[in-house]
């Protein structure tokens, strides 16, 4: 069937359109194009005779039409009047005619639209604004964009006039945005430039900063006011109701108590005609005096005296605070505060109570600290220490002993030998000693302020013979692969060589063995169970030698992975099952058994008489050593066969 296709169907003014013919019959004589839906000689555009290839214009020919041999018609420079129907009349050789009608629509190219507004400065919560998209164009669709997004759904937004008008009711400051309109028809789409809505609002209630309302006498007062407003607000300050100045900031230097009062900021918007105010109450406090501490006892005696520290001056309705060593007061039954916190009493002072102590007076703004006070606690003397620690000396050497005892004021020292006073010095020196200088050497320390004295006695032996040494240890039960052990050979003796033996042999070379302190200390790092041996130390000088009794190291280890015996895993029904578990461990491990995960007994041997196939399963032995904190286990599968069959025993 003969058909006409318009390409395109919607045509922009000034463009061209092709009326394309489909299914053109064979053996044609010629054809004619007509404007309209029927053949009308008055409206013929053009005729075409195939035999002569001659095109003849008709009454409706405009000079913009071109006919093609395939009967298609091209119309150029389309105008609005070209819209409508076009009919093709085909004359066949047998003089039988055929007709077909096609059509197209002509639309104008749209101009760039613009937005007009009925209110350029609407007031928030009061005015409405109507935007209209210009120009008004027939057959055009109107669209709106806010901040390049399609219109939000809002009861305050309304489209009218074929969507050409957008109305915003009761505008708010949030409606301050970029608005665009767009016109569309089948052949074009154009967007307007942005229109920014300028909503007048405010002023909101102003905020005064800083929020601080308490000041000290002598400080500067600098208040700033801000209120959200469009256009920006004009500000005025009032103090106690009296106008001060029309500025956003209020500055008063070197304020006094008289500057206390109510400070009002007024914000005014000349376009909306609105005023808003905020009031803040400012309090100016007089500078309090600097506190100081008085003490009822400037030289207290340790463990005897109490000291009462008082914070001066006494001020009514004031909070007193205390610090010791720059920290708040520790909780201690020896520290007592009076009801008003003004007096701090230290019961039974100790040397650690020296301080420093500070008190503070708290007002509404801050805390004023006193100067620190340090207590002069009289203490001691403690038990004196005599050095060096040697107790054995060889004849002919010099004996030089020094005594020291912690004491405040420093102790006075006296030396006695076998109870007889020698001298009042901190050091005792005797040259070229002999066996007769053996004896009890007493150092007496005396504190003249407290009247206390303490003594320490040291036995000095002057002999060519060395005593029998002994071994002390810092860890009697070390854990394998974890602990170190330090053995020390006692006593410390002058001009003495220290030696060590392990299991009667001299020390082996090992990175885990280290001698220090003049060979007097033997350290075993990362002990192992093999270190559980007999250790002996020896001392010798040029005239004698002696050995200690052996010390055996008790190394805690294990439990190692247990072994279940016998190794058999296959049994005949009716046999006795007797499993024994063993794990190397010190102390001996705690044993326990599980059969198929179910706890059984805590014995080393698991015995089950006359087993059956029901005893098939996994037998687990668990070992635990609480001393090393370690556990271990092993699982063995047991298969019990009915007595008729005889599987070989397998390991």
């Amino acid at each position: 069937k003969l058909t006409i296709e318009s390409t395109p169907f919607n045509v922009a003014e000034g463009k061209e359109v092709l009326l394309l013919v489909h299914n053109l019959p064979q053996h044609l004589f010629g054809y004619s194009w007509y404007k309209g839906e029927r053949v009308d000689g008055n409206r013929q555009i053009i005729g075409y005779v195939i035999g002569t290839q001659q095109a003849t214009p008709g009454p409706a020919y405009s000079g913009r039409e071109i006919i093609y041999p395939n009967a298609s018609l091209l119309i150029q420079n389309i105008i609005q009047n070209d819209t409508g129907f076009y009919t093709l009349h085909v004359i066949k050789s047998d003089l039988v005619n055929e007709e077909a009608t096609g059509q197209f629509r002509v639309y104008p190219e749209l101009p760039k639209p613009s937005i007009s507004s009925n209110n350029s400065k609407p007031v928030e919560d009061k005015d409405a604004v109507a935007f209209t998209c210009e120009p008004e164009t027939q057959d055009a669709t109107y669209l709106w964009w806010v901040n390049n997004q399609s219109l939000p759904v809002s009861p305050r937004l309304q489209l009218s006039n074929g969507n050409r008008t957008l109305t915003l009711f009761n505008v708010t400051r949030n409606d301050t945005a970029s608005y665009k309109c767009e016109t569309q028809n089948p052949v074009s789409a154009r967007r307007s430039d942005s229109v920014i809505l300028n909503v007048l609002y405010g002023p909101d209630a102003p905020t005064i900063s800083p929020l601080n309302t308490s000041y000290r006498s002598g400080e500067n007062l600098n208040l700033s006011c801000h209120a959200a407003s469009n256009p920006p607000a004009q500000y005025s300050w009032f103090v106690n109701g009296t106008f001060q100045q029309s500025t956003q900031e209020l500055f008063i230097p070197n304020i006094t108590v008289n500057n206390s009062g109510s400070y009002t900021c007024q914000a005014h918007n000349s376009d909306t005609g609105l005023n808003r105010t905020t009031v803040t109450t400012i309090t100016v406090y007089a500078e309090p005096p600097k506190p100081f501490i008085t003490s009822n006892n400037s030289n207290p005696v340790e463990d005897e005296d109490a000291v009462a520290l008082t914070c001066e001056p006494e001020i009514q309705n004031t909070t007193y605070l205390w610090w010791v060593n720059n920290q708040s007061l520790p909780v201690s039954p020896r520290l007592q505060l009076s009801n008003d916190n003004r007096t701090l009493t230290l019961l039974s002072v100790t040397r650690n109570d020296v301080g420093p102590y500070e008190c503070g007076i708290q007002n509404e703004l801050s805390v004023d600290h006193s100067d620190p006070v340090i207590l002069n606690v009289l203490y001691g003397p403690d038990d004196p220490t005599i050095s060096p620690s040697y107790t054995y000396y060889r004849p002919g050497v010099n004996l030089s002993l020094s005594c020291h005892a912690a004491s405040n004021p420093p102790a006075q020292y006296s030396w006695l030998i076998d109870g007889n006073i020698q001298q009042h010095t901190q050091e005792l020196f005797i040259s070229n000693i002999t066996e007769k200088n053996s004896g009890l050497y007493t150092c007496q320390a005396n504190n003249s302020a407290s009247g206390h004295s303490r003594t320490t006695v040291k036995t000095i032996t002057v002999s060519a013979e060395l005593p029998k040494p002994s071994i002390s240890s810092n860890n009697s039960k070390p854990v394998e692969d974890k602990d170190a052990v330090a053995f020390t050979c006692e006593p410390e003796a002058q001009n003495t060589t220290y030696l060590w033996w392990v299991n009667g042999q001299s020390l082996p070379v090992s990175p885990r063995l280290q001698l220090s302190n003049g060979n007097r200390t033997l350290t075993l790092f990362n002990v192992t169970r093999n270190d559980a041996r007999a250790y002996v130390c020896g001392i010798q000088n040029s005239v004698s030698a002696n050995r200690s009794d052996p010390v055996t190291l008790d190394v805690l280890y294990g439990p190692d992975t247990p072994i279940i015996s016998p190794p058999d895993s296959s049994y005949l029904s009716g046999a006795n099952l007797n499993l024994s578990c063993h794990s190397a461990s010190n102390p001996s491990p705690q044993y326990s058994w599980r059969i198929n995960g179910i706890p059984q007994q805590h014995t080393q041997v698991l015995f089950i008489a006359k087993i059956t196939p029901n005893n098939n399963g996994t037998y687990a032995c668990f070992v635990s050593n609480l001393a090393t904190g370690r556990n271990n286990s092993i699982v063995k599968s047991i298969t019990v066969s009915a007595s008729g069959t005889s599987p070989g025993l397998s390991a």
Epitope: Y591, L626, A627, G629
Partner: antibody, heavy 120, light 107 residues
Framework: QVQLVQSGAEVKKPGASVKVSCKAS????????LHWVRQAPGQGLEWIGY????????NYSQKFQGRVTMTRDTSTSTAYMELSSLRSEDTAVYYC?????????????WGQGTLVTVSS | DIQMTQSPSSLSASVGDRVTITCRAS??????LAWYQQKPGKSPKLLIY???NLVEGVPSRFSGSGSGTDFTLTISSLQPEDVATYYC?????????FGQGTKVEIK
């Protein structure tokens, strides 16, 4: 269920000996070690020693060394504790107790106790 | 020998009270500590071993804690049937030694 049943009360003169028995049932006698503990009237508990019924190995407290003998009869699942050279301070209730397992375990089952009175 | 020191030697508390008994060893016994309950005229009964393991059948109001040298037996809510003397015992090698006991009574 596990039970330890002890022999009856005894009255002995100073210098004499006493032998207390403890019959075990409800478990494999040779698997668990048996301890002996005594308690003087109104006093606390005092450990005397233990026997390994499987091997007969014994371990006595130093205090009772030389005066105590622990034995067992595996055929009757019975343990015995004999204390010689009795003195008045040996007056006490003597308990046998099973160790919960082997090595470094506490005592989970106790006999009902046997009162031994030493009096002239 | 390892000495075991129990405290207090006696205490009196009301039904529902939380009761705590402490036991101190003279040297490190790690976790090898047991607690026993002995009612008048009866044999001791094992409550706890390895310092914190509750023996099967013992009410959960009994609990043990501690390691090294300091141990605690706690009865979370004392019941009339808990009136007894409680002993601690170390089971870290022989000789086994017991604490002197703590007598618990109801007020």
């Amino acid at each position: 269920q596990v039970q330890l049943v002890q022999s009856g009360a005894e009255v002995k003169k100073p210098g004499a000996s006493v032998k207390v028995s403890c019959k075990a049932s409800g478990y494999i006698f040779t698997s668990y070690w048996l301890h002996w503990v005594r308690q003087a009237p109104g006093q606390g508990l005092e450990w005397i020693g233990y026997i390994n019924p499987n091997t007969g190995y014994t371990n006595y407290s130093q205090k009772f060394q030389g005066r105590v003998t622990m034995t067992r009869d595996t055929s009757t699942s019975t343990a015995y504790m004999e204390l010689s050279s009795l003195r008045s301070e040996d007056t006490a209730v003597y308990y046998c107790a099973r160790e919960y397992g082997n090595y470094n375990y506490p005592l989970d089952y106790w006999g009902q106790g046997t009162l031994v009175t030493v009096s002239s | 020998d390892i000495q075991m020191t129990q405290s207090p030697s006696s205490l009196s508390a009301s039904v529902g009270d939380r009761v705590t008994i402490t036991c101190r060893a003279s040297e490190n016994i790690y976790g090898y500590l047991a607690w026993y309950q002995q009612k008048p005229g009866k044999s001791p009964k094992l409550l706890i071993y390895n310092a914190k393991n509750l023996v099967e059948g013992v009410p959960s109001r009994f609990s043990g804690s501690g390691s090294g040298t300091d141990f605690t037996l706690t009865i979370s809510s004392l019941q009339p049937e808990d009136v007894a003397t409680y002993y601690c015992q170390h089971h870290y090698g022989t000789p086994y030694t017991f604490g002197q006991g703590t007598k618990v009574e109801i007020k």
